[in-house]
């Protein structure tokens, strides 16, 4: 019948991906049971995204491949609703690459996933960006005005943040 | 690992046509959504292709669209680029790349979303 045979593909999926991320969890999305969305363990998720915080040190670029072989992104941060789920589960001693960076060093800063970058939508704290030769920017915690991004070197090992879109199965 | 292997670069005519094949090894093909990429002497390398894990969907810049066209065969673990009416300017080093995906119909178009990289097959086009 027709749910035997939504839950033998189910379950194909899950074999399939289950050599690049070993555990997923998964919710029913609405009423309809067959509509399952997941994020590998332990990733957390918000609407239709998952996230992952790495503590690895890393740099922009490594760390921008860290997440792509997990199929994923560095994170695209597209609402202030989004940011504030993220920064719930960051160390406010620690800073974190995000998905953008300036490669030209001309203040056109572009987001990895190829999103515009909108002006309107940022958050960097009061003063920066500030050095045409940071080139990549992170989130982190200032007492004076708590979450905020910052330009840095891209080459200086930072934690990171992934971002992919959430597996339907 | 992921190993990719391209080939049907060379020297043409304008208005020729080539079609350039990407031969990938080492995992499961049909997980990976694949980008082609092309890098002019003296240039950064640029996207110009883009195909999504099971095909469903394509993605190309503006001065290909109607000219080339991106497939793949997730049977022969393969994926092609048909390029028709060569111009001059299409001259460069051509790219294949995979990134592991779980969407069916995603695109990618930016390059550093791609960790699996070909060396790379020449094509030059004369006028």
């Known amino acids: 019948n027709f749910m035997y045979s939504k839950t033998v593909k189910r379950l194909s999926k899950l074999r399939e991906y289950q050599q690049y991320h070993p555990s997923l969890t998964c919710v029913m999305e609405g009423k309809d049971i067959e509509d399952w969305s997941c994020c590998p363990t332990p990733w957390t998720s918000f609407q239709s995204s998952c996230y992952f915080i790495s503590t690895g040190m890393q740099s922009w670029t490594k760390s921008q491949k860290n997440c792509s072989v997990m199929g994923a992104d560095l994170v695209v941060i597209n609402t202030r609703e989004e940011q504030d789920f993220i920064i719930q589960n960051l160390k406010r001693n620690s800073s974190y690459f995000l998905g953008l960076s300036d490669p030209g060093g001309r203040r056109h800063w572009q987001w990895v996933d190829q999103t515009p970058y909108n002006e309107n939508v940022t958050f960097w704290h009061s003063g920066e960006p500030n050095n045409l030769d940071e080139r990549c920017a992170i989130i982190n915690f200032r007492s004076s005005e708590e979450w905020g991004w910052n330009d840095i070197h891209c080459h200086v090992p930072q934690k990171s943040i992934c971002k992919m879109k959430k597996i339907y199965i | 690992q992921v190993q990719l292997q391209e080939s049907g670069g060379g020297l043409v005519q304008a208005g020729d046509s080539l079609r350039l094949s990407c031969a990938a090894s080492?995992?499961?093909?049909?997980?990976?959504?694949m980008g082609w990429f092309r890098q002019a002497p003296g240039k950064e390398r640029e996207f110009v292709a883009a195909?999504?894990?099971?095909?469903?969907?394509?993605n190309y810049r503006d001065s290909v669209k109607g000219r080339f066209t991106i497939s793949r065969d997730n049977d022969l673990n393969a994926g092609y680029l048909q390029m028709n009416s060569l111009k001059p300017e299409d001259t460069a080093v051509y790219y294949c790349a995979l990134r592991l995906t779980f969407s069916t119909t995603t695109t990618y178009t930016g390059e550093l979303q791609y960790p699996y990289w070909g060396q790379g097959t020449q094509v030059t086009v004369s006028s």
């Open positions: 195909i999504s894990r099971s095909g469903s969907s394509t």
């Open positions: 080492g995992d499961t093909f049909s997980m990976y959504a």
